[in-house]
């Protein structure tokens, strides 16, 4: 997260940290009980290496008594997600037990009606990414306050030139922004899950070059099929 | 399939007003900025402006900014170009054209002819 | 406003023949975000133009390989290796960077 601040510790039950090999990957976000939504190119070059959900936690290295490491039964990226497109960025993985709830720990609702968020609307977005441009990582979650840009600013040439389809949405991305590690993390309206961080290479914090965010609504009937 | 049409050309005399309609099809009216393009006979392209279609934001070449002047009616997904106190000099063919990618989608043009 | 400048103006050639057509600017056309907005668009008579080359030397989808585009700063080239029947159109150049965005004042490519 560029130009954002450390949250208020465990004041995001819902925020998952994607991990392979015991590092954090990529953020995910806990839509059921035993389901984290996340981006489906975070797992691109995960190849043998061994992927885990961390949930419960604020700091990545301290202990806390919340956080708890579960391992995966199952991945299912969208089975259009392809990598060299930000379309269908989606992946769902499924916890090997339902998770452990409590104030540090819950499910967020997402969001059904497959209606755009009004352009300007302040969103919450969380992660553990890169929070410079030379590359830091924190080791605490970090969020930003980002208002919703229109898609037909997003799809200028000087932007994102017609890259951004009805099933995305876009954020303002001048100094304050999600970068690298973010992808697949929440992007919350109101309380409710809106969009999630798509995993594109992207270059953060430019006014010009929009964040670029997988709109859930959109996507309601594949997650219900999954979780079904 | 995206499809651009204009409408709304014809002869009007120097100092008469016009109004040009420019009808999309194929895609989601509101997801891209339309900009407007004019090409005198036997001439270059010329750039005109743009407008938002979410917001009704603007953007005029300085040349134009005077007497034309840009609107929308959403629910039609169409995009209008008012053009007051025509010249002789405003005879051309009129294109939309819609930004995203590029100018990769064109009109047919309309031609306005201001002769007396 | 930038001016784009083409030349040449028109140009005589014969099916199979390398064409170059330069375009140059009255000054930088790199966007503040790091990015060259330098396309290149085709126009047959009485029709709209087309799109071929975005961002200096991206093809259109669609577009043929013998198109290509190449430069930085403020020149420009836009080749077309071994000319078909169907190139002989007016070519114009465009700078998407700063507005007003400009157009350049077109080259015709004609038959020898």
């Known amino acids: 997260i560029l130009g954002g601040r450390e949250a208020e510790a465990h004041a995001r039950p819902y925020m998952a940290s994607v991990q392979l090999n015991g590092a954090h990957l990529c953020g995910g976000v806990l839509v059921a009980e035993q389901w984290v939504l996340s981006a489906a190119h975070c797992l691109e070059d995960a190849a043998d290496g061994k992927v885990q959900v961390l949930l419960g936690a604020h700091s990545l290295s301290q202990p806390e008594p919340s956080k708890r490491l579960y391992d995966v039964l199952r991945a299912v990226p969208h089975p259009d997600s392809q990598p060299d497109t930000i379309d269908h960025d989606l992946l769902l993985l499924q916890l090997s037990e339902k998770a452990t709830l409590g104030p540090a720990v819950r499910p967020l609702p997402w969001q059904r009606v497959d209606r755009d968020v009004a352009p300007g609307t302040l969103c919450d977005v969380a992660g553990w990414g890169i929070v410079n441009h030379a590359g830091r990582r924190p080791d605490s979650l970090q969020h930003v306050l980002l208002p919703v840009l229109d898609r037909a600013t997003c799809n200028r040439r000087t932007h994102h030139d017609g890259a951004i389809t009805e099933r995305l949405m876009c954020a303002e991305s001048n100094r304050r922004d999600s970068c690298k590690g973010d992808s697949g993390g929440p992007l919350v309206c109101g309380g409710v899950l809106e969009g999630v961080v798509t995993s594109g290479s992207r270059v953060c914090g430019n006014r010009k070059k929009p964040g670029i965010y997988t709109r859930v609504a959109s996507y309601a009937a594949w997650i219900d099929s999954v979780l079904a | 399939e995206v499809q651009l049409v204009e409408s709304g050309g014809g002869l009007v005399q120097p100092g008469g007003s016009l109004r040009l309609s420019c009808a999309a099809s194929?895609?989601?009216?509101?997801?891209?900025?339309m900009n407007w393009v004019r090409q005198a006979p036997g001439k270059g392209l010329e750039w005109i402006g743009d407008i938002n279609p979410v917001t009704g934001d603007t953007d005029y070449n300085a040349d134009f900014k005077r007497r034309f002047t840009f609107s929308l009616d959403t629910s039609k997904s169409t995009a209008y170009l008012q053009m007051n106190s025509l010249r002789a000099e405003d005879t051309a063919v009129y294109y939309c054209?819609?930004?995203?990618?590029?100018?990769?989608?064109w009109g047919q043009g309309t031609l306005v002819t201001v002769s007396s | 406003d930038i001016q784009l400048t083409q030349s040449p103006s028109s140009l005589s050639a014969s099916v199979g023949d390398r064409v170059t057509i330069t375009c140059r600017s009255s000054q930088t056309i790199v966007h503040s975000n790091g990015d060259t907005y330098l396309e290149w668009y085709q126009q047959k008579p009485g029709k709209a133009p087309n799109l071929l080359i975005y961002k200096v030397s991206n093809r259109f989808s669609g577009v043929p390989s013998r198109f290509s585009g190449s430069g930085s700063g403020t020149d420009f080239t836009l080749t077309i290796s071994s000319l078909q029947p169907e190139d002989f159109a007016t070519y114009y150049c465009f700078q998407g960077s700063h507005v007003p965005v400009t157009f350049g004042q077109g080259t015709k490519v004609e038959i020898k």
């Open positions: 054209t819609r930004e995203g990618p590029s100018f990769a989608y």
């Open positions: 194929g895609y989601t009216f509101t997801s891209y900025y």
